[in-house]
């Protein structure tokens, strides 16, 4: 299996945005790579987003995706937006080298993303 590294913990910003780097130990230069972000919470795993990209090109997520990303060599910089406290969980980076063959698969240990909903601003009387 291909080794995938990602940070253990990330704290989302007050705007509900979290970014982390997913690095894979590529045996060479795959021309087509698929990156999937999975969320594990309460022993359930769900797919958050996925993108397939050609080496040297940008990652393209679906238009309605909450993820964006850029790639550089064997590193993918992922950003997840629109997070709320209930989205706190373990976000796992899965990397697949799709082409050329053979197929390689690597799954990271996950990044625990903590999301804290901002306190509502108190009404002020003037």
């Amino acid at each position: 299996a291909m080794h995938v590294a990602q940070p253990a913990v990330v704290l989302a910003s007050s705007r509900g945005i979290a970014s982390f780097v997913c690095e894979y130990a590529s045996p060479g230069k795959a021309t087509e790579v698929r990156v999937t972000v999975l969320r594990q919470a309460d022993s359930q795993v769900t797919e958050v987003c996925a993108a397939t990209y050609m080496m040297g090109n940008e990652l393209t997520f679906l238009d309605d995706s909450i993820c964006t990303g850029t790639s550089s060599g064997n590193q993918v910089n992922l950003t997840i937006q629109g997070l709320r406290a209930m989205d706190t969980g373990l976000y796992i980076c899965k990397v697949e080298l799709m082409y050329p063959p053979p197929y390689y698969l690597g799954i990271g240990n996950g990044t625990q993303i903590y999301v804290i909903d901002p306190e509502p601003c108190p009404d002020s009387d003037f």
């Epitope: 230069k29 064997n74 050329p100 053979p102």
Partner: antibody
């Protein structure tokens, strides 16, 4: 486990052609990866010569100009090196090796020594 | 072609010591660098790939580091079986190229 084994001439006369065979066991050369020839000169300098891909594609080191050809026999799971118009400068140990596309070499043959001399 | 320069042809060490073998690329190769160990009469064996990842079965006393143009293979707690020649290799750009090698010897 994947194993690669080189075989071929040990002595070639100048201006003649050298032909080497790499026999692969434990993995089909059409299933994936790139199948390379690398040589090591006396003094241990390594030079990558070229590859034949799982799909039959080739790429050669430009330094060898038009002297090199790498072919395969998929039925025997073998690939071959042919180097034309050899000189004493081609005296080396020749290795076959496997890599992922533009990747590091994970499996190597044990090498075969070739001497160019009249 | 990308030239991989291993400036030290020989390095002397003692068992138990730590030693660092360096390699410099003539242009940026990112992290696409591997290291091989070769003993007399044998083929090169992969130690490190993608700059810092150990190949399967390689002891953790071997570590790789660097990026861009400067790369290092560090062997800590050198053992007698580590006395060999070490080659760096760039696989960022074809034609793939190797360093000239650094031979590790006993003091």
């Amino acid at each position: 486990d994947v194993q690669l084994q080189e075989s071929g001439q040990g002595l070639v006369k100048p201006s003649q052609s050298l032909s080497l065979t790499c026999s692969v066991t434990g993995y089909s050369i059409t299933s994936g990866y790139y199948w390379n020839w690398i040589r090591q000169f006396p003094g241990n300098k390594l030079e990558w010569l070229g590859y034949i891909g799982y799909d039959g594609s080739n790429y050669y080191n430009p330094s060898l100009k038009n002297r090199i050809s790498i072919t395969r026999d998929t039925s025997k799971n073998q690939f071959f090196l042919k180097l034309n118009s050899v000189t004493s400068e081609d005296t080396a140990t020749y290795f076959c090796a496997r890599n992922y596309y533009s990747g590091y070499f994970d499996f190597w043959g044990q090498g075969t020594t070739l001497t160019v001399s009249s | 072609d990308i030239v991989m320069t291993q400036s030290q042809k020989f390095m002397s060490t003692s068992v138990g010591d730590s030693v660092s073998v360096t390699c410099k690329a003539s242009q940026n190769v990112g992290t696409y660098v591997a290291w091989y160990q070769q003993k007399p009469g044998q083929s090169p064996k992969p130690l490190i790939y993608s700059t810092s990842y150990r190949y399967s079965g390689v002891p953790d006393r071997f570590t790789g580091s660097g990026s861009g143009t400067d790369f290092t293979l560090t062997i800590s707690n050198v053992q007698s079986e580590d006395l060999a020649e070490y080659f760096c290799h760039q696989y960022d750009t074809y034609p793939l190229t190797f360093g000239a090698g650094t031979k590790l010897e006993l003091k």
